[in-house]
C-alpha cells in the first residue's frame, strides 16, 4: 500500500481523546515525550494533535473510476517534528522525532467506526490498531472477525478553534 | 468499472411500505461506507441515511429515523433502504452512494442513477 | 446539526467567465467538504474533495478552497458543458449538503 503524494490533501488540528472522553495527552520527561490517557479536571487545556491526511492505492485487482482501492492515512503530530510511532515488536506506541519522509511506522489508516468516531490501524501491521491498554495507548490486535467498533480503539476528534500548531 | 444499480422504486399509497436496493459490482463492497440519498421533484440533494462497511453503524436523517431503515449484505454486495410508513413528503429519486475511501465516511465517491419513489393516494 | 447555505442560487454567466460559487456552513467544518456537479436527467457527480483536491478526471478549470465556515467553488472559465447545479456537502458532523446553485449561460 503506497502513499499517493508526498503532500498532506490536508490537515486537522484536534484535540484526541477516547471514547470514554478520556483525553489523549503528551509530556516531555527526560529529553523524551510520554503518551498518558487520563481524565482532565474541568476548564483544563486539552492537548492538540496536528492530523496530517494522505491517500493511499491499496494494492488490488479491481478495476474501477481510479476512486476504488483508496484509503485514507494518517500521520499524527502533537508537537513540532515528532510523530506516533507504531513499535509493533513491542505492541507500544510511541512518540519519535522524525525528518520528512516519515518512516512507514509513523502511518496510520483511518477507520470512520462512527460518523464523528475514529480508529488507527497500522500502516506496518494490518489488523493492529491504536488503542488504550491501562491508561498508556497501545497497539491492538483486532480479529477480523469482531466488530471493529470494540471501544478501546475508538477515538473521537475534537475541533479546535487554534489554528496554530506547536 | 464502478457500477451501481438501485431497484425497487414506483408508486406507492402513503402508510405504505417499500424496499430499495442497491446492487454493487466493481469494487470491493464490504470495504466502503454506503449511503442514500434523496431528491424531491425540482429541489435538491437531502442526505437520508448511511451504514458503516460491516453494518455495524446506521444513521438517518431525523425526519425518516423509526420509519426507514438502511442494510447491507456483503455477500451479495446489496445494500437496502426499507421505507415504512410513507408519506408524501418521501416522494423523490432516491439514490444509492458509495465512500470515496475504504473505511472512510468522508465524500460519496460514485453514484447511481436512481429510482423514483411516488407517495401518493 | 449543521446548515449548509450557498449563494447565489442561480448564477449567469458567459463562455470564458471565471465564476465562483460560494457555501457557508453554520460551524466550523475543518475543510470536511464536498462539491458535486449535477447535470440535468444524471446522477450527481463528485467534482472536489477536502475542499480543495479534484477528483479524478475532473477538468482543471475546477477548484476549491476555504478554511473554517467559508468556501468557494471556482471554474477558471466557463465552459457550455458546465451547465448544472452545484451542492456542497460536508462530513465534519454527520452529512448535510446545501442546497445548490444552478450556473446557467447567458
Known amino acids: 500500500m503506497s502513499i499517493t503524494g508526498i503532500s498532506p490533501i490536508t490537515e486537522y488540528l484536534a484535540s484526541l481523546s477516547t471514547y470514554n472522553d478520556q483525553s489523549i495527552t503528551f509530556a516531555l520527561e527526560d529529553e523524551s515525550y510520554e503518551i498518558y490517557v487520563e481524565d482532565l479536571k474541568k476548564d483544563e487545556k486539552k492537548d492538540k494533535v496536528l492530523l496530517s491526511y494522505y491517500e493511499s492505492q491499496h494494492p488490488s485487482n479491481e478495476s474501477g473510476d481510479g476512486v476504488d482501492g483508496k484509503m485514507l492515512m494518517v500521520t499524527l503530530s502533537p508537537t513540532k517534528d515528532f510523530w506516533l510511532h507504531a513499535n509493533n515488536k513491542e505492541h507500544s506506541v510511541e512518540l519519535h522525532k522524525s525528518e520528512k519522509p516519515l518512516p512507514d511506522q509513523a502511518f496510520f489508516v483511518l477507520h470512520n467506526m462512527h460518523s464523528n468516531s475514529v480508529s488507527f490501524e497500522s500502516k506496518t501491521d494490518p489488523g493492529v490498531f491504536i488503542g488504550v491498554k491501562d491508561n498508556h495507548l497501545a497497539l491492538i490486535k483486532v480479529d477480523s472477525s469482531e466488530n471493529l467498533s470494540t471501544e478501546n480503539i475508538l477515538f473521537k476528534l475534537s475541533e479546535t478553534h487554534h489554528h496554530h500548531h506547536h | 468499472e464502478v457500477q451501481l444499480v438501485e431497484t425497487g422504486g414506483g408508486l406507492v399509497q402513503p402508510g405504505r411500505s417499500l424496499k430499495l436496493s442497491c446492487v454493487a459490482s466493481g469494487f470491493t463492497f464490504s470495504n466502503y461506507w454506503m449511503y442514500w440519498i434523496r431528491q424531491a421533484p425540482g429541489m435538491g440533494l437531502e442526505w437520508v441515511s448511511s451504514i458503516n462497511n460491516d453494518g455495524g453503524n446506521t444513521y438517518y436523517l431525523d425526519s425518516v429515523k423509526g420509519r426507514f431503515t438502511i442494510s447491507r449484505n456483503n455477500a451479495e454486495n446489496t445494500v437496502y433502504l426499507q421505507m415504512n410508513s410513507l408519506r408524501s413528503e418521501d416522494t423523490a429519486t432516491y439514490y444509492c452512494?458509495?465512500?470515496?475511501?475504504?473505511?472512510?465516511?468522508?465524500?460519496?465517491?460514485?453514484w447511481g442513477q436512481g429510482t423514483l419513489v411516488t407517495v401518493s393516494s | 446539526d449543521i446548515q449548509m447555505t450557498q449563494s447565489p442560487s442561480v448564477l449567469s454567466a458567459s463562455v470564458g467567465d471565471r465564476v465562483t460559487l460560494s457555501c457557508k456552513a453554520s460551524?466550523?467544518?475543518?475543510?470536511?467538504l464536498d462539491w458535486y456537479q449535477q447535470k440535468v436527467g444524471e446522477a450527481p457527480k463528485l467534482l472536489i474533495y477536502?475542499?480543495?483536491n479534484l477528483q479524478t478526471g475532473i477538468p482543471s478549470r475546477f477548484s476549491g478552497s476555504g478554511s473554517g465556515t467559508d468556501y468557494t467553488l471556482t471554474i477558471s472559465s466557463l465552459q457550455p458543458e458546465d451547465v448544472a447545479t452545484y451542492f456542497c456537502?460536508?462530513?465534519?458532523?454527520?452529512?448535510?449538503f446545501g442546497q445548490g446553485t444552478k450556473v446557467e449561460i447567458k
Open positions: 477536502f475542499t480543495n
Open positions: 452512494a458509495k465512500g470515496h475511501y475504504y473505511y472512510s465516511s468522508y465524500s460519496l465517491g460514485y
Open positions: 456537502f460536508q462530513y465534519n458532523s454527520g452529512w448535510t
Open positions: 460551524h466550523n467544518i475543518n475543510k470536511h
